[in-house]
Structures are given as structure tokens and as C-alpha cells.
């Protein structure tokens, strides 16, 4: 067990704060909730404390709880590529160019990190390029989330790690919206930490709303599990 | 467990105001008042972040109620003005362990008595 991953043996409360300024539209999310790694397991609630958000809730998904893979679950026979894990409490850097087909592009940094008993995902966001009545900017995606895969290998030049992955927004006509997302993690600290063979992430969510809750709001329940690497049987004669 | 006392309610005329005070036994995330007339469902008023960087208010009361805190004496405040009979309920704060402000009932830990306002 790495040291890091020392730190999510039971519930742990996330906090997520951010920022974003998309085509101009400024805007603030608090996020709040907590994580079960034993079972890749996140419950999280969002506010936009500026009032309405100017993009669909559905697009910052990956920002939010994706930017949290520190909760994955990873069985035993994978726990030694668990680079989110490893990295705790320090924390990593998260850097992210998220591309929308014929639309424009997100790129958002976060530091993940303890703060206290509390992890903390901090955002940036910058979005450019998006045309005001297409399929962000006009609010034309249904409010739900698919399954992905997310692909992650070793960047050993800058002991992290890197992932690419497609999203697959519904929209409301029946077609679908793709975002190609390029991921890249870095360490805070300078300690050990664990970089992976390649595997993927298997994300499961689902996005509903708090009947009681006046202000522009998403509550999310995501389950996160490792796989892609088989396990090795020693059989002895 | 953090115990919620309010003070400050009262009877007062129409266009006046009143301001509640809520002590609260220790420290506290967000904090908010919430009220409720008879036979109705008690509502979320308006609040603050455990953080103080975020407020928020039902329309009806916009522009006329304030709150504020200070985090040394534990203590919330829901400053009232230019009051309204529909103003009439009890009024309860309540509070949060944690800072961010929410205005669903269930994200609430703790709860006061509440302070009757009469208008």
C-alpha cells in the first residue's frame, strides 16, 4: 500500500471549487460532497453561487469528479498503478484540453490535494471558441451522463501520468455532442509516487437534481473502477 | 452537537424593520434562515457560506433582508427591512457542518426553536 493511498481507506469529504470565464461568461461552482475509494464511489452536489450557469452542468462532469480519480477503485492486483493514490496528501496538478466537435474547446488546470481531512479539487477553467447558439453556449444537451473509458499511461518524463478519452454528450435532438479530452497529472510533492502500465478507468454516472434546492444545481453519483490489467495467477505444482 | 438559539423577533408594523440574532455553541460551515408561515412549508430565506464569500436570497425577500456573520462571537444575523405582512412566520436558523451554502432543508445539521415575526 502506498502512503497516499493510506488515506482513503473510509469516507473522506471533497470540496470542489470553480472558476470559469467561457466566451466571456464568468462564472463560480462550489461543489461539495465525499468519496469511497474501497468502492469508487463519489456523491458530490454543485452550486453556481453566480447564478445560472452559462454552459450545460453535463460538460463540467469531467472537470469535477473525473478530476478526482484519486477514488477509484482499484482492485488488489492493480493497486501498484494507482498514481492518484500515490500522490496524496500533496496532491497532484491536473491539466486538461477538452475539444467539443465543431464547437470550441475548455482548458482547465486543478490542484487535487489535501487540505486538512478534506480533498480539494481547485479549478481554472477557460473556455474559447464556442458558437453562442451551438450545442453549449445554446443548452441543447439533455441533462444525463454516459459510461467512458478512461485510457491512462505512464509520463515518466514528468513522473505523472497521461489519459485520453471521448465523451459522448446526448443532446436533445437525438444526435450526440463528442468532447476528446487530453489529460495530463503532475505531482505537488516531490515524494515517491506510482506510475502505472497502461489501463483504463470504467466511470459510471448519473446526474439528478435536489427537488429543495432554489439555486442552478447538479447532484452527481459516480462509481469509478480500475481495470484493463489482468491479474496473475501463481500456480504451484 | 452545535446548539442554535435565535433572538430578535417581535411584533412590528408594516415597512418596519427587525434584525434576529442566532447564536450558535461553537463553530459552524454555512449558515441560513428559513421560516415558515401556518399551514405552509418552512422555506429557505437567505444564508452565507462558512467561507463568507457566497450569499444568497429568495426573490421575495432580495433587497430588503441581509445576513451576515461574525465567526468570533459564533453568531449570524438576518437584518430585516421595509417588512411586509407576508413576511409573517417563525423564523429558525440552521446550520451546516460543512462551508459550502446550500437552500435544501436536508443539507442542514443543525436547527434552532425558532423566533416568532409577527408583521
Known amino acids: 500500500m502506498s502512503k497516499g493511498e493510506e488515506l482513503f481507506t473510509g469516507v473522506v469529504p471533497i470540496l470542489v471549487e470553480l472558476d470559469g470565464d467561457v466566451n466571456g461568461h464568468k462564472f463560480s461552482v462550489s461543489g461539495e460532497g465525499e468519496g469511497d475509494a474501497t468502492y469508487g464511489k463519489l456523491t458530490l452536489k454543485f452550486i453556481c453561487t453566480t447564478g445560472k450557469l452559462p454552459v450545460p452542468w453535463p460538460t463540467l462532469v469531467t472537470t469535477f469528479s473525473y478530476g478526482v480519480q484519486c477514488f477509484s477503485r482499484y482492485p488488489d492486483h492493480m493497486k501498484r498503478h494507482d498514481f492518484f493514490k500515490s500522490a496524496m496528501p500533496e496532491g497532484y496538478v491536473q491539466e486538461r484540453t477538452i475539444s467539443f466537435k465543431d464547437d470550441g474547446n475548455y482548458k482547465t488546470r486543478a490542484e487535487v490535494k489535501f487540505e486538512g481531512d478534506t480533498l480539494v479539487n481547485r479549478i481554472e477553467l477557460k473556455g474559447i471558441d464556442f458558437k453562442e447558439d451551438g450545442n453549449i453556449l445554446g443548452h441543447k444537451l439533455e441533462y444525463n451522463y454516459n459510461s467512458h473509458n478512461v485510457y491512462i499511461t505512464a509520463d515518466k518524463q514528468k513522473n505523472g501520468i497521461k489519459a485520453n478519452f471521448k465523451i459522448r454528450h446526448n443532446i436533445e435532438d437525438g444526435s450526440v455532442q463528442l468532447a476528446d479530452h487530453y489529460q495530463q497529472n503532475t505531482p505537488i510533492g516531490d515524494g515517491p509516487v506510482l506510475l502505472p502500465d497502461n489501463h483504463y478507468l470504467s466511470t459510471q454516472s448519473a446526474l439528478s437534481k435536489d427537488p429543495n434546492e432554489k439555486r442552478d444545481h447538479m447532484v452527481l453519483l459516480e462509481f469509478v473502477t480500475a481495470a484493463g490489467i489482468l491479474e496473475h495467477h501463481h500456480h504451484h505444482h | 452537537d452545535v446548539q442554535l438559539v435565535e433572538s430578535g423577533g417581535g411584533l412590528v408594523q408594516a415597512g418596519g424593520s427587525l434584525r434576529l440574532s442566532c447564536a450558535a455553541s461553537?463553530?459552524?460551515?454555512?449558515m441560513a434562515w428559513f421560516r415558515q408561515a401556518p399551514g405552509k412549508e418552512r422555506e429557505f430565506v437567505g444564508g452565507i457560506s462558512g467561507s463568507e464569500t457566497d450569499t444568497y436570497y429568495v426573490d421575495s425577500v432580495k433587497g430588503r433582508f441581509t445576513v451576515d456573520r461574525d465567526n468570533v462571537k459564533n453568531t449570524v444575523y438576518l437584518q430585516m427591512n421595509s417588512l411586509k405582512p407576508e413576511d409573517t412566520a417563525v423564523y429558525y436558523c440552521?446550520?451546516?457542518?460543512?462551508?459550502?451554502?446550500?437552500?435544501?432543508?436536508?443539507?442542514?445539521?443543525?436547527w434552532g426553536r425558532g423566533t416568532q415575526v409577527t408583521v
Open positions: 461553537g463553530p459552524t460551515g454555512a
Open positions: 440552521a446550520a451546516r457542518r460543512r462551508i459550502t451554502l446550500f437552500t435544501s432543508r436536508t443539507d442542514y445539521d443543525f
